[in-house]
């Protein structure tokens, strides 16, 4: 069986139609189309809830950029 020893990749079948405030977001991960039916972004909120979002939407791209910058900027 392929990749049987690897944890299964979670998939998204629907995307949220609500913009999520960046203050509520803790992290994200990308899901590629070779592993799942849809390319997706999964945001994890500060209360550890996971939400599927459409990577083609501007607010999703902006939120990823924001989280990337947060990660790159060391907190003092």
């Amino acid at each position: 069986q392929p990749d049987a020893i690897n944890a299964p990749v979670t998939c998204c079948y629907n995307f949220t139609n609500r913009k999520i405030s960046v203050q509520r977001l803790a992290s994200y991960r990308r899901i590629t189309s070779s592993k799942c039916p849809k390319e997706a972004v999964i945001f994890k909120t500060i209360v550890a809830k996971e939400i599927c979002a459409d990577p083609k939407q501007k607010w999703v791209q902006d939120s990823m950029d924001h989280l990337d910058k947060q990660t790159q900027t060391p907190k003092t």
Epitope: C11, E50, I51
Partner: nanobody, 125 residues
């Protein structure tokens, strides 16, 4: 746990057709998505097609759109992959897999964690 058994693979000439079947047992499948994946020698496994058990929404990889059709028979707990206009590059081991949906519409699923043993499809030119 979900048990999946594929059948229907074989050797076919380019341009020909095959129908793969995946018989599922062990669960009530209403909250599952059933998928077909394939893995060619030396390549990564790739998504081919999927269908929601409840509602029947379908999803396809771009490489098979218009050529492959996924369907299900709820009474038989079986998912089918009708493959037409086959090409040599479709040669691979085809796997059936099951994915449990999240609790809400926008939650990610559990992932394709249950797999069949695979069935070989060879397309000769």
């Amino acid at each position: 746990e979900v048990q999946l058994v594929e059948s229907g693979g074989g050797l076919v000439q380019a341009g020909g057709s095959l129908r793969l079947s995946c018989a599922a047992s062990g669960r009530t499948f209403s909250s599952y998505v059933m998928g077909w994946f394939r893995q060619a020698p030396g390549k990564e496994r790739e998504f081919v097609a999927a269908i929601r058990w409840s509602g029947g929404s379908t999803y396809y990889a771009d490489s098979v759109k218009g050529r492959f059709t996924i369907s299900r028979d709820n009474a038989k707990n079986t998912v089918y992959l009708q493959m037409n206009s086959l090409k040599p590059e479709d040669t691979a081991v085809y796997y059936c897999a099951a994915d449990l949906l999240g609790d809400s519409d926008y939650e990610p699923s559990s992932g394709f964690g249950s797999w069949g043993q695979g069935t070989q499809v060879t397309v000769s030119s």
